[in-house]
């Protein structure tokens, strides 16, 4: 399941950039866009047994994410 609000804030950014629910911060254009416009990870259907596509992203210990999701481990996540 996707987390709703996302934002990024960092040394390179002059001010926090909050994203409302259902929006994600796109680093390439440096503003919030609808999450559906980005290739955000999709949760696998329950009971899915087929292997994941080659080289698809998977969450790791250092990435705070729910099942099937690679979430941003960012200080600016609201």
């Amino acid at each position: 399941m996707r987390r709703g609000p996302r934002s990024l804030r960092g040394r390179d950014a002059p001010a926090p950039t909050p994203c409302v629910p259902a929006e994600c911060f796109d680093l390439l254009v440096r503003h919030c866009v609808a999450c559906g416009l980005l290739r955000t990870p999709r949760p696998k259907p329950a009971g899915a047994s087929s292997p994941a596509p080659r080289t698809a992203l998977q969450p790791q210990e250092s990435v705070g994410a729910g099942a099937g999701e690679a979430a941003l481990p960012l200080p600016g996540l609201l």
Partner: antibody
Framework: VQLQESGPGLVKPSQTLSLTCTVS????????WNWIRQHPGKGLEYIGY???????YYNPSLKSRVTISRDTSKNQYSLKLSSVTAADTAVYYC????????????WGQGTLVTVSS | DIVLTQSPATLSLSPGERATLSCRAS??????????MNWFQQKPGQAPRLLIY???NRATGIPARFSGSGSGTDFTLTISSLEPEDFAVYYC?????????FGGGTKVEIK
């Protein structure tokens, strides 16, 4: 998600190289859709992208000769490289990065384009 | 552009040995608390395959013997115990800013 490059394998010098990437399993109206090339026996060179909105970015080293476009009805995007020389002989890959790390996790198998008369 | 320098250019090792590959960036690839450094494996005649993203996260299906570390400008890919199928060329790539750039590659060959 599967990506498949297609186009002529041989292009004459001074002509325009044209390749198409057909995407299945995802819509090109979501995400960033890239072209990368690899000269024989060499490393990887980033060419540019077309985004979910249709906006484009081209590597400044190739910008004057590159055009990336898309056909959303066919879920395809294309690369055109004009005024080619032998130095443009390479394997051309289409690829797409996932959000939020912009790591290119999906690649086409690549297509070799030879520039020769 | 961010320039990535990989070393060594070639690494000659035997199966079972540990491989340590280095990638140095001309400027920091960190932003918003993330290191935007990725590692790819490429075998002859094949497309690159994503191994590691965001410096230290394994892509799906990548064995645990592959690990990545580093931040800022210095990054390392480690293969803890080389398997026969690991002999290939490895590239680092930064995705902090466009143009996305790749290192020149490290070839891991059988000694």
């Amino acid at each position: 998600v599967q990506l498949q490059e297609s186009g002529p394998g041989l292009v004459k010098p001074s002509q325009t190289l044209s390749l198409t990437c057909t995407v299945s399993g995802d819509s090109i109206t979501s995400g960033y859709w890239n072209w990368i090339r690899q000269h024989p026996g060499k490393g990887l060179e980033y060419i540019g992208y077309i985004s979910y909105s249709g906006s484009t970015y081209y590597n400044p080293s190739l910008k004057s000769r590159v055009t990336i476009s898309r056909d959303t009805s066919k879920n395809q995007y294309s690369l055109k490289l004009s005024s080619v020389t032998a130095a443009d002989t390479a394997v051309y890959y289409c690829a797409s990065p996932n959000y939020p790390f912009y790591a290119m996790d999906y690649w086409g198998q690549g297509t070799l384009v030879t520039v020769s008369s | 552009d961010i320039v990535l320098t990989q070393s060594p250019a070639t690494l000659s090792l035997s199966p079972g040995e540990r491989a340590t590959l280095s990638c140095r960036a001309s400027e920091s690839v960190d932003n918003y608390g993330i290191s935007f450094m990725n590692w790819f494996q490429q075998k002859p005649g094949q497309a690159p395959r994503l191994l590691i993203y965001a410096a230290s996260n394994r892509a799906t299906g990548i064995p645990a013997r592959f690990s990545g570390s580093g931040s800022g400008t210095d990054f390392t890919l480690t293969i803890s115990s080389l398997e026969p199928e690991d002999f290939a060329v490895y590239y680092c790539q930064q995705s902090k800013e466009v143009p996305w750039t790749f290192g020149g590659g490290t070839k891991v060959e059988i000694k």
